[in-house]
Interface confidence: low
């Protein structure tokens, strides 16, 4: 299953399959997730080791048993691949690293005014993988405001150095934020020239294209079909690149198919997995296990559940079957692709779905009347769980925020439904940033059921929590995916990086904002909060957040929206925007429903009709 816990001060011994430099443990974990053999990783931050060569070292590891011995190493961080973790699987990495220089091939330098602009340039440059930006205070004036666009053979820095007044980060192309746009066309009977960066075997050009999309240096590809004239080259997928970023030439060639990486697509990327099953095809590879199952779909499920399995063949040969069950061969290889593809067989083959980010139909948890005042604009995909709850009577308007917590579930505040309990009048918009982008053609979700907490009373602040079951499940994308919930009664975690988001008023007597706003707000103890609200009871089922001096807060229209905190690289839904005295007033923090205190209720209500819990734990 999905394991998300990180082990501090621990290093996995042995099992190395690859190593690289990464700026933090989360990026290392992402590289592990996308590496075909990696199950475990260990990361050495700069502070953890004196050996200059190993600083920022990310060590990817495999193990037949799924685990390795952990040794104590101060400062080291270890953890698991996120294969099988559904919506948490993403190659998108937005963080900016201050005081760090990520080294690589500097192929472009320009002057820009901010690190965000530099990241945008990288994202809009076809060859850029990562970048470094020298700030206004950099000690060499001629380098100040320099934006260096970079690439490397493996897509990760060739070295990482601690360096004052330099900021680094990665291209946001894997976040589907590139302005370049992509070529969806597949060109039949055409072969591209230029440099081959890798060679794999694939059953068709579409798998070849997906592999190209997620390969750090592949910009385009040529696939040789199973009837290509040279037998040894059949089903070969050649991943290619060029200096210019486009093929310098193409040759008409029977039984070849060419196309482009889809990494530069805007708003939608292919899933990093291959779900199609290929009848009459055998995939060869290293044998992991053989099991008897009923049907090829069960064989694929079995492969997906066995984390080391990369692909499978379901044999229908009489000698491989007994009763209704036949042999399911679970296989793997060094590069995640079959080592041999045979046609005209009595088997059916396919791939593990361990990297599909749709996951199962679940809510994400972890084991371990009020807008944003003083906030700033959010960017696409920054808060993909944020939804807008709108009411359509005669006109249509935004009333509340909410948080997507599963394919079919939204968590919000109960008071949003005060006087509007009819599910038919509500429209739920997800995967949006600007309210002005909503037109009559914009897809929305309708409500199947509104579940208001049984102890909630109108005009009272207590138990201000409600669940919405959507009529149809939503697919997950980079712009629309759930937020993880905290563990039950989570009181030990100290959250220091918390944000509130919403389209609500930017001042007490204001108006709904067009662009989703975000504000970084510190949590306040309940004791401190109670002092500020002597006429109200601040219960243990509430959490408060705000600045003593005011100036930043949620406000009208943000109600029901998320208070999220980042801990160990993972965002969790800590609170639901509930109430407060005015907005952003001095010494009047915002009050939020404490989600951890309602985990039993959420679990109970999100159980499916067959009684199976709709909760999945990544930990």
């Amino acid at each position: 299953g999905c394991l998300t816990q990180l082990y501090e001060n621990a290093f996995f011994r042995g099992g190395d399959v690859a190593s690289m430099y990464t700026p933090n443990a989360q990026y290392c974990q992402m590289r592990c997730t996308f590496h075909p053999r990696c199950l475990l990783f260990s990361f050495l931050p700069a502070s953890s080791i004196n050996d200059m060569e190993k600083r920022f070292g990310c060590f990817l590891k495999d193990s037949v048993t799924g685990t390795l011995p952990k040794v104590h190493r101060t400062g080291a961080v270890s953890g698991h691949s996120l294969k099988q973790c559904g919506h948490q699987i993403s190659a998108c990495h937005r963080d900016i690293y201050k005081g760090v220089d990520m080294r690589g091939v500097n192929f472009n330098v320009s002057k820009v005014s901010s690190v965000e602009e530099c990241q945008k340039r990288c994202t809009s440059n076809i060859r850029c993988q990562f970048f470094s930006y020298a700030t206004q205070t950099f000690h060499k004036a001629e380098y100040r405001n320099n934006c260096l666009l970079k690439y490397s053979p493996g897509g990760t820095p060739t070295a990482i150095k601690v360096l004052s007044n330099v900021e680094s980060g990665f291209s946001l192309k894997p976040c589907a934020l590139s302005e370049i746009g992509c070529h969806m066309n597949i060109f039949q009977h055409l072969a591209f020239s230029d440099v081959d960066v890798a060679r794999v075997l694939t059953p068709d050009a579409f798998v070849c294209r997906t592999i190209c999309t997620y390969h750090p240096n592949c910009l385009f590809f040529t696939f040789y079909t199973n009837v290509w004239k040279i037998e040894s080259q059949r089903n070969v997928c050649l991943l290619k690149t060029s200096e210019s970023g486009t093929p310098s030439s193409s040759t008409p060639q029977e039984n070849t198919i060419s196309g482009y990486s889809l990494l530069t697509c805007k708003r939608t990327l292919p899933e990093p997995c291959h779900s199609k099953i290929y009848p009459g095809v055998d995939f060869g590879g290293e044998e992991l296990n053989v099991t008897f199952v009923k049907g090829v779909n069960v064989c694929q499920e079995t492969c997906t559940k066995m984390i080391r399995c990369q692909f499978f063949t379901y044999s229908l040969l009489p000698e491989d079957c007994k009763e209704e069950k036949c042999k399911c061969f679970l296989r793997l290889s060094m590069d995640g692709s079959p080592t041999r593809i045979a046609y005209g067989t009595q088997g059916s083959s396919g791939y593990s779905l361990r990297l599909c980010n749709t996951g199962d139909n679940s809510v994400c948890t972890t084991k371990t009347s009020t807008r944003i005042v003083g906030g700033t604009n959010s960017s696409w995909g920054e808060w993909p769980w944020q939804v807008s709850l709108q009411v359509k009577l005669t006109a249509q308007r935004h009333l509340c925020g909410g948080s997507l917590i599963g394919h079919q579930w939204v968590l919000t505040a109960a008071h949003c439904f005060d006087g509007l309990p009819l599910q038919d009048v509500w429209r739920i918009y997800s995967g949006i940033l600007n309210l002005s982008d909503i037109t009559k053609d914009t897809p929305f979700s309708q409500i199947k059921e509104i579940i208001i907490h049984q102890n909630y009373k109108v005009s009272e602040g207590n138990h201000d929590i409600a669940l919405i079951k959507l009529q149809a499940p939503l697919n997950y994308t980079e712009f629309q995916k759930p937020i993880c919930l905290p563990s039950k009664g989570d009181t030990s975690t100290i959250y220091t990086n918390c944000w509130v988001t919403g389209w609500g008023f930017s001042k007490e007597k204001g108006e709904i904002q067009n662009i989703l706003q975000k504000v970084n707000i510190p949590l306040v103890t309940n004791e401190e909060c109670q002092k500020r609200y002597q006429d109200y009871k601040i219960t243990q089922r509430m959490v408060c957040a705000g600045y003593k001096e005011g100036g930043k807060d949620a406000c009208k229209g943000d109600s029901g929206g998320p208070l999220v905190c980042k801990h160990n690289g993972m965002w969790r839904l800590v609170g639901i925007t509930s109430w407060g005295e005015g907005c952003a007033r001095r010494e009047q923090p915002g009050v939020y429903t404490k989600v951890a205190e309602y985990m039993d209720w959420i679990l109970e209500k999100t159980q499916s009709s067959d009684g199976k819990a709709q909760m999945q734990s990544p930990a």
């Epitope: 700069a46 220089d101 060499k140 004036a141 001629e142 150095k161 360096l163 004052s164 007044n165």
Partner: antibody, heavy 124, light 107 residues
Framework: EVQLLESGGGLVQPGGSLRLSCAAS????????MTWVRQAPGKGLEWVSG????????IYADSVKGRFTISRDNSKNTLYLQMNSLRAEDTAVYYC?????????????????WGQGTMVTVSS | DIQMTQSPSSVSASVGDRVTINCRAS??????LAWYQQKPGKAPNLLIY???SLQTGAPSRFSGSGSGTDFTLTISSLQPEDFGTYVC?????????FGLGTKVEVR
Amino acid sequence: EVQLLESGGGLVQPGGSLRLSCAASGFTFSLYDMTWVRQAPGKGLEWVSGISSSGGVTIYADSVKGRFTISRDNSKNTLYLQMNSLRAEDTAVYYCARTYYYDSSGYADAFDIWGQGTMVTVSS
Amino acid sequence: DIQMTQSPSSVSASVGDRVTINCRASQDISNWLAWYQQKPGKAPNLLIYAASSLQTGAPSRFSGSGSGTDFTLTISSLQPEDFGTYVCQQSYSLPWTFGLGTKVEVR
């Protein structure tokens, strides 16, 4: 032999000016950033100013900003420090030093070659 | 500015002794630290750069260690010519700053 030789120090009244020079020999002067460091009598070392190899970039400690000007003449292999509006607290031995980049990017600095120093006394 | 604090301010030792000098930065400076030896009336002389790398020409009895905020210069076997003041310097961020020095006297 790699060498730096300072000159131009002496006694000057408060508010006065002085120009220090540092002659470099034994290495390709134009490839190196240079710096001035001073040491008041009985006190510790204090970084004063730095200049990039081309002379295009200059940096100063807050204590001398607006009063001191660092410059260089690569054709003469010489580094300069023009000191105006001198104060009693500027009294020190002034060293010029070569900036050694031990990190290949040229971003992290240590001072590997030093001159013998020249004494500047500001007193009425 | 980053403050560099050295301890002890002076140390008296005999020839052949192992001498340890400490330097603490007021904030994390990674490994951007240099050590210099300075004799009375003379200019400083670079011994160690990048916290632990020995400068060409410096005797191998000198070694540096540490990372972050705490650093150490060690003289494994003190020699008569090792008397003088040892100064640490950070090159992590401007302005470059020096410690006040540790005076090593030969007993």
